[in-house]
């Protein structure tokens, strides 16, 4: 069942996801002037088991001016996952960033993809909020929203975040994207598909802070 609405918007804030629950679908969309290759996948699907999740299928775009000749190829999903955690990650990258059970990471960019990514979310998906540049965050609870199923209906919870117009002055270099806990929120066993776009709601960004007052920027 589809979540009825997009996650709530908060004034002067932006949100996205850092991990996608199994069952999430991502449409294979190409930017203007490009199209999916003939017989190319319509979507990517986050699948897996308790120990390993990855994106099935791949998205490939080719120039609309060509007819099934030169194609822009992206790695197979398995290659994408491996590349994301090894080869293309510099030595700087923290380890185990992709080890959230039952979740897939953000798929790496593919050539000539559309500006917006259209995801179809399942119940239990969380999105995480940050204040935009020039605003500071005040909250007494999690700056996140989760798609829940209650009495047969879906809804997004309201994030406890207020962004005030006070310019930020500090950097908080220790700020991290915490791992979202898939077990930390009650979920219905019913899968709930949600259609939303990357620029309208995004997936799971764990950026809540322990402190009740902290500063973030939107860039």
């Amino acid at each position: 069942e589809l979540c009825d609405d997009d996650p709530p918007e908060i004034p002067h804030a932006t949100f996205k996801a850092m991990a996608y629950k199994e069952g999430t679908m991502l449409n294979c969309e190409c930017k203007r002037g490009f199209r999916r290759i003939k017989s190319g996948s319509l979507y990517m699907l986050c699948t897996g088991n308790s120990s390993h999740s990855s994106w099935d299928n791949q998205c490939q775009c080719t120039s609309s001016a060509t007819r099934n000749t030169t194609k822009q190829v992206t790695p197979q999903p398995e290659e994408q996952k491996e590349r994301k955690t090894t080869e293309m990650q510099s030595p700087m990258q923290p380890v185990d960033q992709a080890s959230l059970p039952g979740h897939c990471r953000e798929p790496p960019p593919w050539e000539n993809e559309a500006t917006e990514r259209i995801y179809h979310f399942v119940v239990g998906q969380m999105v995480y909020y940050q204040c935009v540049q020039g605003y500071r965050a005040l909250h007494r609870g999690p700056a996140e929203s989760v798609c829940k199923m209650t009495h047969g209906k879906t809804r997004w919870t309201q994030p406890q975040l207020i962004c005030t117009g006070e310019m930020e002055t500090s950097q908080f270099p220790g700020e991290e994207k915490p791992q979202a806990s898939p077990e930390g929120r009650p979920e219905s066993e019913t899968s709930c598909l949600v259609t939303t776009t990357d620029f309208q709601i995004q997936t799971e960004m764990a950026a809540t802070m322990e402190t009740s007052i902290f500063t973030t920027e939107y860039q």
């Epitope: 996650p7 918007e9 932006t14 949100f15 996205k16 850092m18 930017k31 822009q72 994301k84 293309m88 510099s90 700087m92 990258q93 923290p94 960033q97 953000e106 790496p108 960019p109 050539e111 000539n112 993809e113 559309a114 500006t115 917006e116 990514r117 999105v127 940050q130 204040c131 935009v132 540049q133 950097q171 908080f172 270099p173 700020e175 991290e176 994207k177 990357d198 620029f199 309208q200 709601i201 995004q202 960004m205 950026a207 973030t216 920027e217 939107y218 860039q219």
Partner: nanobody, 130 residues
């Protein structure tokens, strides 16, 4: 497959300048924040600067403000980091990276500072001698 390719690193004297380039052919810039991290030997990585492809918003860590300038040429799928008045402490391997924007095409610097990027380049060495 889509890759980030850095160039422009090298050896320069303190006070000198370098211009780094990051080529990302095929990347849809409008959907990403693109920029630079650096890591000096034995030190933590740090997010130096980024620019958003949606509206060109820029970010710099305090230590490079006024000295470094990030820019992009979307037509060439390239991001540049102009580094002026270089200091020995700027010596590091500089990595290009991209991260997906958030809702409404916006981005938060906390996401960049976390270092949890969607794609990385292989890096280019910058050495500033005193």
């Amino acid at each position: 497959q889509l890759q980030l390719v850095e160039s422009g690193g090298g050896l320069v004297q303190a006070g000198g300048s370098l211009r780094l380039s990051c080529a990302a052919s095929g990347l849809t810039f409008e959907g990403y924040a693109i920029g630079w991290f650096r890591q000096a030997p034995g030190k933590e990585r740090e997010g130096v600067s980024y620019i958003t492809g949606s509206d060109g918003t820029t970010y710099y860590i305090n230590s490079v403000k006024g000295r470094f300038t990030i820019s992009s040429d979307n037509a060439k799928s390239t991001v540049y980091l102009q580094m002026n008045t270089l200091k020995p402490e700027d010596t590091a391997v500089y990595y290009c990276a991209v991260d997906r924007l958030g809702s409404q095409g916006r981005y938060a610097s906390a996401w960049w500072r976390s270092g949890d990027m969607d794609l990385w380049g292989k890096g280019t060495q910058v050495t500033v001698s005193s």
